[in-house]
């Protein structure tokens, strides 16, 4: 195993319909054809796999589960968008990336973007 | 109606390792999210680990590094891989399952798992 940087933004605000966006940009020493893309949550005192998603470079990437995560690649960039998100949600959100193919396996961990999630205050009623 | 099994428990010298399993039938295991819970003597019961259906984990801050959840859709089995094994550790390990979209805050509540085993304890000596 092999290290290999990752870079993503300190801190994001998600949107008032809850949906975050940050890029995951990875420093890849070779040609890899096959990337693992996992987002890590570490909040509340636990660490969890938040989606994940195996692409091959160049294609879409396809995401595990009913996930909450959708993305898009370009080169060594990643474009990851959370959605679905809540006050509750806040915490830091770890990209990890994973190059596992061709040989030699890399393995790459961001320092994480702290993403700040603010419930939209419900309209006041209105008389018209 | 699921059922679940679980096994492995013993007691352990600290440093020790332990591999637990749990054993699902009556239900199709693999559309559940499977969680390891334990609870200690006078304590409330804790999270200590969870796996979605396609293998996407979560573990408490304290186990990361030393317990490793994983399951086998084809036995209907998820294991708990303990390694460098704690005092702290001691404690019924219980096994659970429910179904819901996978979720960093739902993984660690009681109240999201629908069916639960009897629990196998762990003791670890110092």
């Known amino acids: 195993c092999k290290a290999m940087h990752v870079a993503q933004p300190a801190v994001v605000l998600a949107s008032s319909r809850g949906i975050a966006s940050f890029v995951c940009e990875y420093a890849s020493p070779g040609k890899a054809t096959e990337v693992r893309v996992t987002v890590l949550r570490q909040a509340d005192s636990q660490v969890t796999e938040v989606c994940a998603a195996t692409y091959m470079m160049g294609n879409e990437l396809t995401f595990l589960d009913d996930s909450i995560c959708t993305g898009t690649s370009s080169g060594n960039q990643v474009n990851l968008t959370i959605q679905g998100l809540r006050a509750m949600d806040t915490g830091l959100y770890i990209c990890k990336v994973e190059l596992m193919y061709p040989p030699p396996y890399y393995l790459g961990i961001g320092n994480g973007t702290q993403i700040y999630v603010i419930d939209p205050e419900p309209c006041p009623d209105s008389d018209f | 109606e699921v059922q679940l099994v679980e096994s492995g428990g013993g007691l352990v010298q600290a440093g020790g390792s332990l591999r637990l399993s749990c054993a699902a039938s009556?239900?199709?295991?693999?559309?559940?999210?499977m969680g390891w819970f334990r609870q200690a003597p006078g304590k409330e019961r804790e999270f200590v680990a969870a796996i979605s259906p396609s293998g996407l984990t979560s573990y408490k801050d304290s186990v990361v590094g030393r317990f490793t959840i994983s399951r086998d859709n084809a036995k209907n089995t998820v294991y708990l891989q303990m390694n460098s094994l704690k005092p702290e550790d001691t404690a019924v390990h219980y096994c659970a399952a429910g179904q819901w979209t996978w979720s960093p805050l739902r993984v660690s509540r009681l109240a999201e798992y629908n069916y639960w085993g009897q629990g196998t304890q762990v003791t670890v000596s110092s």
């Open positions: 009556g239900g199709t295991f693999s559309s559940y999210a």
